[in-house]
């Protein structure tokens, strides 16, 4: 849903422009006053002149009061109540309700199972560039270095674990000591943090939606690099993360247990194997130097093989090479060696889609992301409209009730910590924070949970995943057993020492700030968060990645002044925003610099140039699969299916006045005023025409 | 069969070389190595060198390094070995034997080649 | 180079008897050893090889056994046609080496 038009100077009495109004067109923002403002510190509020022909049932849209952007949404029930209906009534509205809930654990399965897939994806496409990252001999040196791959690797693998993995072998087969593996976990917990984002970016649709569901996915992110910006300089310097955990890891005899509870796995597996199958071996073995396992392909296609171990006569370059001098024998021209090896006799095929096609696994890499991306979509879509229509009225208020209310006092405190534990379980349960998270992305942004609350669950879940790993590491064969142990601890007490930082005084808790910003942000510029993507999960990572391998004179030549730059930039900024009379008048605001250095709109401007062809072919599109879908779910022949098409028609705003348009399951007079949502007016054969 | 004929005996003058052949038949030629040992009147065994064929690479005995070239010709699997600078010492039959595949026990061997050198 | 020590040189035996020879070697050759029949003017003939592992063809009154430096082998009921000269040959290492034999007579 498109934002309010941002107004410099909002009247806080509607009556002085709903009386008095003469013309249907909108009123101008006074621009005068924007001088001293950025972006995101705009606040957004609707002013509209109204004839007074004009039906009451359009008051109710307008909001008598400056709204805060990110309060919740009311979702008010219109539907007939549970006393009103009839025995027929309550039989289909009981039959309803037992539908909607199959419905949406159905698609809350597959957005679970796409998101595997969509790992599977992004392992088969940039798996094996994801290894040879590791097999850089600079990590052990460049603590820097070690955190950006862990980053990129992460981010083109979609899984922590799959890199964790790869760290905890390469430790334990000595090519990494646990010094160097730390910025690596480090950068895998990052890394982890896009998946919600990418899901995220799918409710992109609605302004107000999008606001409040990239803030609160990208509060995972920001909580992961400031939680890096300041424990990575102190790991450099004191190693405390590998002092403590090496203490832990040596005061207990451990023995290897069973292996950690697959839980969500367990329902999901039989589906997601249907699909694709990989060999995660092979990354690691490309990370390991491992030059044979460039050429395997990721896709498994034997998922039952027989492994013999047989003594076999193997020839040798040298008698150095020999297992022993007396199992060592020449045939005249080489020399033999007797060596236990393995052979690995196939027996059945894996029964996935992908089996008998033989692709490069870039191919079947592609077509699975492209797949995996749209399930999401398709089920996050339908998990948001199953939510939006079960999450009303009394439902609403006690979910919601239930999830953002605090303790009584004096223990309100205690409830961000109860969260936290709720968030670390519910992972533990999923095994897979990804999940976890990306679950939480869209009851955000409908408004079922205030970032607030989504900040200490996502910590609790960045917990819940590093329990996960202990987990597997108690269960990893003796010679993994205690670099895989300490590495998992290692990435455990990162992220407790990250909650310290950022969580226990609300002072601290910066990165819900700087979510709301980014969210803000977001809203108005949505192209922007795409670019925030890139920039901070890519770009940042390989220019990084690249001076590294440069070395650390051109690092630091190139990092020192851009780090200089940043914090000045952050200290003025703070100043302007605190105390700006300590600054000279020109230093007061950004003024004194090209507007495209410090506003988004020539950039806006720019990109909507490039994008302006795109939008009314998408539009339509967006259009007709809208309405196919109103009719497969049986809404309202007048449901509203333009969502994605807001942007083209506030320009048509100009020409008449919004009237809300009804929201499918929604009866007219809902007022949802508190969303902030100002619709376009649909046109009675827009209604009915298909 | 596996069977290994070797070429006649030879004369030859101190200073002179001599190409003594051994044509195989009977088995795949390229898998196996071919060794050369000799044996001087009333002597025991002494190795010269061996050949693998089916690439052409030789190991020779330190003591004949210099001396010594083994060739081999897959189109007509015969291996040959070529003794230069001979001396008087070098009086002995040569034989090829068959290297088992894998190591160096020799399953088959020539009848034998007598090269004689004297002046 | 690895220096094989046979012995005794000369044995004269009876047909029916068994007879043993043994085979040292200067180093420690696993069981790299293989142990060769020859008649006079005829090509020698492998018997044994892998130190006890018998060649096809070849009758199981011939056994070889031993490992490292130290091997024996042994005739166990000698028949006419067996009396030979019999050589040992270590593969442990380049270059190959022989015994200096073992001359087989008829008492």
């Known amino acids: 849903m498109a934002p309010w038009p941002e107004l410099g100077d909002a009247q806080p009495n509607p009556s002085k422009y709903l009386e008095g109004a003469t013309s249907q067109q909108p009123i101008t923002p006074d621009k005068s006053k924007e001088t001293n403002k950025t972006d995101n510190t705009e606040v957004p509020v609707t002013k509209f002149e109204l004839l007074p022909t004009y039906s009451t049932a359009t008051l109710i849209e307008e909001p008598t009061e400056v709204d805060d952007p990110w309060n919740l949404p009311t979702l008010q029930d219109s539907g007939i109540k549970w006393s009103e209906r009839d025995a027929k009534g309550k039989i289909l509205c009981v039959f309803q309700g037992i539908g909607r809930l199959i419905l949406l654990l159905g698609f809350l399965y597959f957005f679970v199972c796409s998101l595997d897939v969509l790992s599977s994806a992004f392992q088969l496409v940039g798996g094996k560039m994801a290894g040879q990252f590791f097999s850089n001999s600079s990590i052990m040196s460049n603590p820097l270095l070690g955190l950006v791959i862990g980053v990129l690797v992460t981010v083109f693998v979609q899984s922590s674990s799959t890199s964790t993995s790869i760290v905890v072998s390469m430790v334990a087969s000595s090519l990494l000591t646990v010094r160097a593996a730390i910025p690596i976990i480090m950068g895998a917990n990052i890394g982890t943090s896009i998946t919600n984002t990418i899901v995220a970016l799918m409710q992109v649709g609605d302004r107000s939606e999008f606001r409040r569901a990239f803030a609160g996915a990208t509060v995972h992110d920001f909580f992961n690099w400031l939680s890096v910006l300041v424990l990575l300089p102190v790991e450099v310097a004191t190693h405390y993360l590998e002092v403590v955990t090496q203490l832990i890891v040596e005061s207990f005899h451990f023995k290897n247990g069973e292996d950690a509870p697959d839980l969500l796995k367990v329902i999901t597996k039989p589906f997601t194997k249907l699909i694709v199958q990989l060999d995660k071996k092979v990354i690691s073995q490309i990370a390991m130097n491992d030059e044979t396992a460039k050429n395997k392909s990721l896709v498994k296609i034997w998922c039952k093989t027989f492994t013999n171990m047989t003594q076999m006569n193997v020839t040798v370059p040298s008698m150095a090479n020999c297992t022993s001098p007396s199992l060592c024998w020449t045939d005249g021209i080489q020399i033999w060696t007797m060596k236990n090896v393995t052979y690995k006799e196939n027996i059945a095929k894996c029964q996935h889609i992908f089996v008998n096609f033989h692709l490069p696994d870039l191919a079947v890499g592609i077509i699975l992301l492209i797949i995996s991306l749209l399930v999401l979509c398709g089920c996050l879509i339908m998990i948001v409209k199953i939510l939006g229509s079960v999450l009303k009225g009394q439902v609403a208020t006690v979910i919601k009730k239930t999830i953002n209310t605090d303790f009584p006092f004096p223990f309100a405190w205690l409830t961000g910590y109860l969260a936290i534990l709720v968030g670390a379980g519910m992972t533990f349960i999923v095994q897979s924070s990804s999940v976890f998270t990306s679950a939480l992305t869209p009851l955000i942004g409908i408004g079922v949970i205030t970032i607030e609350r989504a900040y200490p669950l996502t910590l609790g879940s960045n917990i819940g995943t590093t329990t996960t790993a202990i987990l597997a590491a108690l269960a990893s064969p003796g010679n993994t057993l205690r670099s895989s142990l300490q590495i998992a601890l290692c990435h455990f007490f990162f992220n407790i020492s990250g909650i310290l930082l950022w969580y226990p005084i609300p002072f601290t808790r910066l990165p819900i700030r700087m979510a709301k910003g980014l969210g803000n942000i977001s809203a108005k510029y949505r192209w922007f968060a795409i670019f925030y993507l890139i920039i901070f999960f890519f770009l940042i990572p390989l220019t990084v990645f690249g001076l590294s391998l440069a070395g650390w004179p051109v690092l630091v030549g190139v990092g020192v002044p851009v780090v200089f730059i940043i914090i000045l930039v952050l200290c003025l900024r703070l100043l302007q925003s605190r105390c700006p009379r300590v600054l000279p008048k020109k230093l007061q605001n950004w003024n004194f610099l090209p507007l495209c250095m410090h506003s988004l709109k020539p950039w806006d401007a720019v990109i909507s140039k490039f994008t302006g062809p795109f939008q009314m072919p998408c539009c339509c599109c967006c259009r007709v699969c809208c309405r196919v879908c109103c009719l497969l779910c049986g809404c309202p022949k007048c449901c509203r299916c333009s969502k994605c098409c807001q942007d083209l028609e506030e320009g048509q705003e100009a020409q008449g006045v919004p009237v809300k348009a009804p929201e499918t399951f929604d009866n007219i007079t809902i007022s949802r005023e508190a969303q902030g949502e100002v619709r376009a007016p649909d046109s009675k054969t827009e209604c009915t025409a298909l | 069969q596996v069977q290994l004929v070797q070429s006649g005996a030879e004369v030859k003058k101190p200073g002179a070389s001599v190409k003594v052949s051994c044509k195989t038949s009977g088995y795949t030629f390229t898998t196996n190595n071919m060794h050369w040992v000799r044996q001087a009147p009333g002597q025991g065994l002494e190795w010269i060198g061996a050949i693998y064929p089916g690439s052409g690479a030789t190991a020779y005995n330190q003591k004949f390094k210099g001396r010594v070239t083994m060739t081999a010709d897959t189109s007509t699997s015969t291996v040959y070995m070529e003794l230069s600078s001979l001396r008087s010492e070098d009086t002995a039959v040569y034989y090829c034997?068959?290297?088992?595949?894998?190591?160096?026990?020799?399953?088959?061997w020539g009848q034998g080649t007598l090269v004689t050198v004297s002046s | 180079d690895i220096q094989l020590t046979q012995s005794p040189s000369f044995l004269s035996a009876s047909v029916g008897d068994r007879v043993t020879i043994t085979c040292k070697a200067s180093q420690d050759v696993g069981t790299a050893v293989a142990w060769y029949q020859q008649k006079p003017g005829k090509s020698p003939k492998l018997l044994i090889y892998?130190?006890?592992t018998r060649h096809s063809g070849v009758p199981d009154r011939f056994s070889g056994s031993g490992s490292g430096t130290e091997f024996t082998f042994t005739i166990s009921s000698l028949q006419p046609e067996d009396f030979a000269t019999y050589f040992c040959?270590?593969?442990?290492?380049?270059?190959?080496?022989f015994g200096q034999g073992t001359k087989l007579e008829i008492k």
């Open positions: 892998w130190a006890t």
């Open positions: 040959q270590q593969y442990s290492s380049n270059p190959l080496t």
């Open positions: 034997a068959r290297g088992m595949y894998g190591h160096g026990a020799m399953d088959y």
